[in-house]
């Protein structure tokens, strides 16, 4: 691994999907068709594209990205409605920088409420809070300029789960590209 950790192998916590089949690996099946489909990736905690062969496979397969998100991402519909309804900046944008406890080395971005800008920080890979983004773009879309332009900025964000760490759930809201298993 490079110094910038691959998130499939980090000290980062995971969140439980809504259904057990959401935890299944993408299975293209034995057939040879090439059908664009979507699956929920347990490691990146988001819905991603994969190519389905057209037969067999498993239940972690959806025709649309939206269907995948609705089925497997906790709180998705609630946050999607909130995002669509206006430019409300989520509360977690105001949380202080928290690199967590661990010694991973992940280049991340957070919204700085003092400067009103997204800035870089190093995340250790476990615990921490939800003011933690993989890309500058994602941070800007959700915290700097919510509701501006694309409209669905919050769609891939999880509702915080109630756990004993101070700031709610682990900050794993990723925007990875195709991650075929």
């Amino acid at each position: 691994l490079s110094e910038e950790a691959d998130d499939t192998d980090s000290e980062l916590g995971s969140m439980k999907p809504l259904h057990t089949f959401c935890a299944m690996k993408a299975d293209d099946g034995p057939c040879k068709a090439m059908i664009r489909s979507y699956f929920f990736n347990m490691y990146t905690h988001q819905c991603e594209e994969f190519i389905y062969g057209g037969c067999e496979g498993n239940e972690n397969r959806f025709d649309t990205l939206e269907e995948c998100k609705k089925t497997c991402i906790p709180g998705y519909e609630k946050t999607a409605v909130k995002a669509a309804s206006g430019a409300e900046r989520p509360d977690f944008c105001f949380l202080e920088e928290d690199p967590g406890l661990c010694r991973g080395y992940m280049k991340r971005y957070l919204y700085n409420n003092q400067t009103k800008q997204c800035e870089r920080f190093v995340y250790g890979g476990c615990l921490g809070n939800r003011n933690n983004f993989e890309t500058l773009d994602e941070c800007k879309k959700i915290c700097e300029n919510p509701g501006g332009g694309s409209g669905g900025g919050l769609n891939d964000i999880f509702e915080a789960q109630k756990i004993e760490w101070h700031e709610g759930g682990p900050p794993h809201h990723h925007h990875h590209h195709h991650h075929h298993h």
């Epitope: 995971s14 690199p99 615990l127 760490w165």
Partner: antibody
Framework: EVQLVESGGGLVQPGRSLRLSCAVS????????MQWVRQAPGKGLEWVSG????????GYADSVKGRFTISRDNAKNSLYLQMNSLRAEDTALYYC?????????WGQGTLVTVSS | QSVLTQPPSASGTPGQRVTISCSGS????????VHWYQQLPGTAPKLLIY???HRPSGVPDRFSGSKSGTSASLAISGLRSEDEADYYC???????????FGTGTKVTVLG
């Protein structure tokens, strides 16, 4: 040179409390997560608790959850462990440690003995 | 009892290669980094390998780390008498939300 010095250990009766301290010199701790790790006599290492630089992330081993409280005072460059309702099985050498991205700093430990 | 399992002991003669395993699960080694420590008798642990396979400065390249699936390994090549110590793996466990050390392996240099 970075030095971590633990103190506060000693002999204590079951059910009583003890507060451990770890004073750090040669490094400003503000930006670093800190840990407590213990080792019972003749046994292996056990992570006890950890706290992020700004105290916003805190974790505990199941064996101490609800009894031990970790805290830090960055102005004093110090880490603390408040240990309540102590049990015989908490008897150990308690190390304070800083896990950096690519290195570690450890103290030499302070011995806690819980016995009646 | 630890969720990371190591063999209690390992041994070899000077110059030999010794490998120590650390077996866990998807909630720790399977998705998290593994770090390795050496503890010489009567001293504090020393970081030997961090993030699966990186060596801190000052650690000889005789020590190497690797990871596959839910297991990790520490290899010591060209074993020397000063390598006689206890070795521990460490990983964050996502289910426990805690760091967990392995059970520890005592390495003995024979002869």
């Amino acid at each position: 040179e970075v030095q971590l010095v633990e103190s506060g250990g000693g002999l204590v009766q079951p059910g009583r409390s003890l507060r451990l301290s770890c004073a750090v010199s040669g490094l400003t701790i503000d930006n670093y997560a800190m840990q407590w790790v213990r080792q019972a006599p003749g046994k292996g290492l056990e992570w006890v608790s950890g706290i992020s630089g700004n105290s916003r992330s805190i974790g505990y081993a199941d064996s101490v959850k609800g009894r031990f409280t970790i805290s830090r005072d960055n102005a004093k460059n110090s880490l603390y462990l408040q240990m309540n309702s102590l049990r015989a099985e908490d008897t150990a050498l308690y190390y304070c440690a800083i896990f950096l991205h690519e290195s570690d700093y450890w103290g030499q430990g302070t011995l806690v003995t819980v016995s009646s | 009892q630890s969720v990371l399992t190591q063999p209690p002991s390992a041994s070899g003669t000077p110059g030999q290669r010794v490998t120590i395993s650390c077996s866990g699960s998807t909630s720790n080694i399977g998705t998290m980094y593994v770090h390795w420590y050496q503890q010489l008798p009567g001293t504090a642990p020393k970081l030997l390998i961090y993030r699966n396979n990186h060596r801190p400065s000052g650690v000889p390249d005789r020590f190497s780390g690797s990871k596959s699936g839910t297991s990790a390994s520490l290899a010591i090549s060209g074993l020397r008498s000063e390598d006689e110590a206890d070795y521990y793996c460490l990983a964050w466990d996502d289910t426990l939300r805690a760091y967990v050390f392995g059970t520890g392996t005592k390495v003995t240099v024979l002869g």
